[in-house]
């Protein structure tokens, strides 16, 4: 299966809104998407969110911080191909995120 293509849709100081897409023929085989994310530089702990939709908002994040985000399709056969590992950054408190 083709891996999900992931986009950053929006961000705040404490959240990241992420969406993804896969080719329509594959969508019927997917029952959930698993979103794994963690702070950049912190390889010991990560968070997992599961959703049936094509987007998620990751909340309670730290300001001006980069997070590694990956989306994986879950099918009846098991895990599909994972997306690229993306780096998304929350806004700084001043709102001047680069």
């Amino acid at each position: 299966t083709e891996p999900p293509k992931v986009r950053l849709e929006g961000r705040s100081t404490t959240s990241l809104s992420v969406s993804w897409s896969i080719p329509p023929p594959q969508q019927s085989r997917v029952w959930k998407y698993e979103v794994t994310y963690r702070k950049k530089g912190d390889s010991n702990s990560y968070n997992v969110r599961r959703t049936e939709g094509f987007s998620v908002t990751l909340d309670d994040l730290a300001p001006d911080t980069t997070y590694l985000v990956q989306v994986q399709a879950l099918t009846q056969e098991g895990q599909g191909a994972g997306s690229k590992v993306h780096e998304f950054q929350t806004l700084s408190p001043e709102g001047s995120g680069n």
């Epitope: 390889s43 994972g82 690229k84 780096e87 680069n98």
Partner: antibody
Framework: QVQLQQWGAGLLKPSETLSLTCAVY????????WSWIRQPPGKGLEWIGE??????????NYNPSLKSRVTISVDPSKNQFSLKLTSVTAADTAVYYC?????????????????????WGQGTMVTVAS | SYVLTQPPSVSVAPGQTARITCGGN??????VHWYQQKPGQAPVLVVY???DRPSGIPEQFSGSNSGNTATLTISRVEAGDEADYYC???????????FGGGTKLTVLG
């Protein structure tokens, strides 16, 4: 179009300190993570480390195999960054390159660690011999 | 630390297609970049983000990446393509940049 020009001593004795500087012409200096890469004669490429200067803070990241001996610093007023490698041995003999990543490190919240290098310095051959 | 494995050498006849592989654990989740280096010169970026070409790089250079292998494909190979080729990724687990060992492409004849 960004250009990189590098210079520094080409012949060192063992235990001395290697010192190279790379000047950046054009482009936005603070938007990028600037890297040093080396290539021993007849061998492959080895990433040494990178530096970014944002605000008044330097962000450094070094290859673990060289970390104890490497310092990469910046002079933002001159758009220059420098490499220092202490206690050199013959194994440090190589062509040393400075390099610029293809994209600014972060743009609208999307970041590119370890981006491709689209512009390279001309290379400096450094020989360590007694 | 993350390791990228390339074949030391690949040989191909002029006009044929050369495929150079870069192996790494779950490399499909990473963006792979490819460089061409000719003797005495600095490396030149020929493919980035698995399959994108910088401006000025001909269409004969293409790339793909899936599972544990990324591939640089050079179609209609000519003598001027003889060079060393290197793959590169960012290892997000260690936050370090890694190069493959390089592949020497020889154009026969």
């Amino acid at each position: 179009q960004v250009q990189l020009q590098q210079w520094g001593a080409g012949l060192l004795k063992p235990s001395e300190t290697l010192s190279l500087t790379c000047a950046v012409y054009g482009g936005s200096f603070s938007d990028y993570y600037w890297s040093w890469i080396r290539q021993p004669p007849g061998k492959g490429l080895e990433w040494i480390g990178e530096v970014n200067h944002r605000g008044s803070i330097n962000y450094n990241n070094y290859n673990p195999s060289l970390k104890s001996r490497v310092t990469i610093s910046v002079d933002p007023s001159k758009n220059q960054f420098s490499l220092k490698l202490t206690s050199v041995t013959a194994a440090d003999t190589a062509v040393y390159y400075c390099a610029k990543p293809l994209r600014p490190h972060c743009t609208n919240g999307v970041c590119y660690s370890g981006d491709a290098f689209d512009i390279w310095g001309q290379g400096t051959m450094v020989t360590v011999a007694s | 630390s993350y390791v990228l494995t390339q074949p030391p050498s690949v040989s191909v006849a002029p006009g044929q297609t050369a495929r150079i592989t870069c192996g790494g654990n779950n490399i499909g989740s990473k963006n792979v970049h490819w460089y061409q280096q000719k003797p005495g010169q600095a490396p030149v970026l020929v493919v980035y983000d698995d399959s994108d070409r910088p401006s000025g790089i001909p269409e004969q250079f293409s790339g793909s990446n899936s599972g544990n292998t990324a591939t640089l494909t050079i179609s209609r190979v000519e003598a001027g393509d003889e060079a060393d080729y290197y793959c590169q990724v960012w290892d997000s687990s260690s936050d370090h940049l890694v190069f493959g060992g390089g592949t020497k492409l020889t154009v026969l004849g």
